[in-house]
């Protein structure tokens, strides 16, 4: 057999299709849990309509050794125009309170799939 | 101070690749997003990719994502962007330009001039 | 994919008011778009003016302002000077790519 050619790249993913991927991954993970997410973790509570995807992930960026949000935290860093490192926090102009990473993934999904619904894929 | 300096001017026949560099310094390569620009001669800007330096993660426009292919040499602190199949309308000149937060599109090399012409 | 559109040319008088808009074909513009403001002039590389919506850029004049109008990114120019008579791009952030906008020559008249 001979090979005519490489793999064809992949196109970029849709603003849709990247969405609705990350929609259910947050779903995943809600349905998934046992133990509490991420051991109970803290972290900071965001503004869903001001920056929200860079203001996720400065937010969850800092939790470390959970694997349950490795993902997330992945395809979060895909949605940010901008490099996000732990201890960032250019986006989160606001940091007055803290809540469980379970809670945080919880509020995030109903925001996305209130947008999905919306049309609102940008 | 940051700089980003380019590979200079290309001429280059259609069906070719052009491979261009943007070697940086002044700052820490892996510590920023870097993005490419597109502007043909008196015309607008195009958006065509970024990677990440860290991990060599891409993210592509729709319009160029079979022919372009972007990377980074974190040895040489050296991002390069390679466009296939050339034809007469990517003539153009070509940016490299740091992203961050706080300064998006702040610095800018000064730009790789590519003629494609039979 | 989404196109981003700007008024093609506007004109303003030296010390005037200028609005310049982004309009998304997709929807309305939001903070999660992190539009970016540029201005170029001629043989020149762009240069960011306003990032993340309404941020000014370091050394940037504070006679450019950014902001939402109703479903638009805008940039305002408050006080004209001949200097500020250049192309100006927005560019808008869809989840995972940029778009530049068409383009809006200014001119200072």
């Known amino acids: 057999l001979t090979c005519l050619g490489g793999f064809a790249s992949p196109g970029p993913v849709p603003p849709s299709t990247a969405l609705r991927e990350l929609i259910e991954e947050l779903v995943n993970i809600t349905q998934n849990q046992k133990a509490p997410l991420c051991n109970g973790s803290m972290v900071w509570s965001i503004n869903l309509t001001a920056g929200m995807y860079c203001a996720a992930l400065e937010s969850l960026i800092n939790v470390s050794g959970c694997s349950a949000i490795e993902k997330t935290q992945r395809m979060l860093s895909g949605f940010c125009p901008h490099k996000v490192s732990a201890g960032q926090f250019s986006s989160l102009h606001v940091r007055d309170t803290k809540i469980e990473v379970a809670q945080f993934v919880k509020d995030l999904l109903l925001h996305l799939k209130k947008l999905f619904r919306e049309g609102q894929f940008n | 101070e940051v700089q980003l300096v380019q590979s200079g001017a290309e001429v280059l026949k259609p069906g070719a690749t052009v491979l261009i560099s943007c070697k940086v310094s002044g700052y820490t390569f892996t510590d920023y997003y870097m993005h490419w620009v597109q502007q043909a001669p008196g015309k607008g800007l195009e958006w065509m990719g970024r990677?990440?330096?860290?991990?060599?993660?891409?993210k592509y426009a729709p319009k160029f994502h079979d022919r372009v292919t972007i990377t980074a040499d974190t040895s040489t602190d050296t991002a390069y962007m390679e466009l296939s199949s050339l034809r007469s309308e990517d003539t153009a000149v070509y940016y490299c330009t740091r992203y961050d937060y706080y300064g998006p599109f702040a610095y800018w090399g000064q730009g790789t001039l590519v003629t494609v012409s039979s | 994919q989404a196109v981003v559109t700007q008024e093609p040319s506007l004109t303003v008088s030296p010390g005037g008011t200028v609005t310049l808009t982004c309009r998304s074909s997709?929807?309305?513009?939001?903070?999660?778009?992190?539009a970016n403001w540029f201005q170029q002039k001629p043989g020149q590389a762009p240069r960011t003016l306003i990032y993340g919506t309404n941020n000014r850029a370091p050394g940037v004049p504070a006679r450019f302002s950014g902001s939402l109008l109703g479903d638009k990114a805008a940039l305002t120019l408050s006080g004209a000077q001949p200097e500020d008579e250049a192309e100006y791009y927005c560019a808008l952030w869809y989840i995972n790519h940029f778009i530049f906008g068409t383009g809006t020559k200014v001119t200072v008249l």
């Open positions: 997709t929807g309305a513009v939001t903070t999660s778009n992190y």
């Open positions: 990677i990440d330096p860290e991990d060599g993660e891409t």
